[in-house]
Interface confidence: medium
């Protein structure tokens, strides 16, 4: 479109600061920018994990960018220089691409890495991760877990391992201050005298793996001759009421099973005077207003009514 030319950025590289997947992409300005002293050049950066179908694209005036990646796979990135239109009379001037890649050289065969990694953030308070040892690894193999999230100066190692047969098979995390609503990075690596062990990397956000406690204080209140209100209280802990969804299971006279999902701590049930027995249980889950995903709590203790008391105003266990 134009004779004006601009070089790509120099020294484009991906730097691993040791944060288990949170990487720095950095570069230097292109050579020969003297003609464009009055211009702030921009850079279009594209990057992805190798094998991903989609690139992430950003445009920045800075000489660095940070983002999270899956270190189980390689990373590829490319960048080019853009001259603002103001500097080129509206012509579109961009450099060729500078490209770079990064990957961690894998040690050991894939089967040696931990299997069935499972992390649960109990009641939005206690994080616990568990795993199974790799396939065919010997008992001398031990696994170590490291974690990092934005706010920590460096990656930390688990200090409270769960063990089985002398092997680490899980980690109880300490209190994790200001750790939700941001990427939480984990690496589980291992050592064995006999063979190298493959590392595994995991990334999630804590609010999406919360398993709350079950609801408590289940009660019945007769609203009218044909309506009974079921009520319960939110479980103890830091999760606010606005963050819960509930699932109710109701059994009437050992025959009818009603299940319902509700957002409040009440449910009104249509019933008849012939009802002899009514039981219900409730479980809770963090809702879409507070997380993208979650784990259902265990069911609450069962609350039942039997006999004539159902016609009375309030029924408590």
């Amino acid at each position: 479109d134009t004779e004006i030319k601009v070089n790509p950025p120099q020294d484009f590289e991906i730097v691993d600061p040791g944060y288990l997947g949170y990487l720095y992409l950095q570069w230097q300005p292109p050579l020969s920018l003297d003609h464009f002293k009055e211009c702030t050049v921009e850079y279009e950066l594209k990057y992805r994990n190798i094998g991903s179908e989609t690139w992430k694209t950003i445009i920045t005036k800075n000489l660095h960018y940070k983002d999270g990646f899956d270190l189980n796979k390689g990373i590829e990135a490319k960048i080019h220089t853009l001259l603002p239109w103001q500097c080129t009379n509206g012509s579109e001037v961009q450099s060729s691409w500078a490209e770079t890649t990064y990957w961690i050289s894998p040690q050991g065969i894939p089967e040696t890495k931990v299997q069935d990694m499972d992390c649960v953030y109990y009641n939005w308070q206690y994080l616990l991760c568990s795993w199974k040892p790799g396939i065919g690894v010997l008992l001398d193999t031990n696994y170590n877990l490291f974690y990092w999230y934005e706010g920590l100066d460096h990656a930390l190692q688990c200090v409270d391992y769960i063990k089985a047969d002398g092997q680490n098979i899980g980690c109880r995390f300490p209190y994790l201050e200001a750790s939700d609503y941001k990427d939480f990075y984990i690496c589980v690596n291992g050592s064995s005298e006999n063979k190298p062990i493959r590392s595994s990397y995991f990334t999630f956000q804590l609010q999406n793996i919360v398993k709350p406690l079950p609801p408590v204080y289940l009660t019945f209140t007769r609203e009218s001759s044909c309506e009974i209100k079921l009520k319960w209280s939110i479980p103890l802990g830091p999760i606010p009421a606005r963050c819960f969804d509930y699932e109710i299971e109701i059994r009437e006279d050992d025959t009818t099973l009603v299940t319902a999902t509700v957002e409040n701590e009440t449910y009104t049930l249509k019933t008849t005077n012939e009802t002899r027995q009514l039981c219900f249980v409730v479980r809770s889950k963090v809702n879409i207003y507070c997380s993208d995903d979650g784990i259902w709590s265990e069911w609450s203790d069962k609350q039942c009514w039997e006999g004539e008391d159902l016609s009375k105003k309030t029924l408590l266990r």
Epitope: D1, L82, G90
Partner: antibody, heavy 119, light 107 residues
Amino acid sequence: QVQLVQSGAEVAKPGASVKVSCKASGYTFTSYWTQWIRQAPGQGLEGIGAIYPGDDDTSYNQKFKGRATLTADKSTSTVYMQLSSLRSEDTAVYYCARGATLLRPFPYWGQGTLVTVSS
Amino acid sequence: DIQMTQSPSSLSTSVGDRVTITCKASQDVSTAVAWYQQKPGKSPKLLIYSASYRYTGVPSRFSGSGSGTDFTLTISSLQPEDFATYSCQQHYSIPPTFGQGTKLEIK
């Protein structure tokens, strides 16, 4: 000079899909983003998404994610926009346009393709 | 997405008049605003980019100003060929979003 030539008008039934093409010439096809923008009768312009033919990178307006699919054929310097599950509100003129990047205005536009959704 | 609100939606005016069209962004977009002219049955034509820079070949009677959230397109002396619809666009963040357009009609 830069030219974007789009395919002809289309009539489609609700629930069907339509594929509009945009053939580029006069520049290095793989080095620039091609945007798709639509304009319903009497309405303003609305961005659908963009594709970078150099590596098939795409960027979709959230409103059209899952319904619009952008593809590029390097051998013919043509970009395609397919819109599925059509409804009457999708009746519009669909434009392809070229900017240097995702965040540049569009000095070059196709002539537009009228898509009419009607049962 | 950033909303672009344009006013007025239509304007009856005469050749030789000075015309001002405004565009308000729902959040700060620095100076990343473009203006387009569109005539019936035709594609939009880029007039102004980066709030105040005239695109190649655009007559000097067209000028743009503003930064942050408030932007203005001014036509200093309206010519017969300027009767058209004018739209603003933010090119600050993805997806690009446009104003609803201002139609200039002959009084």
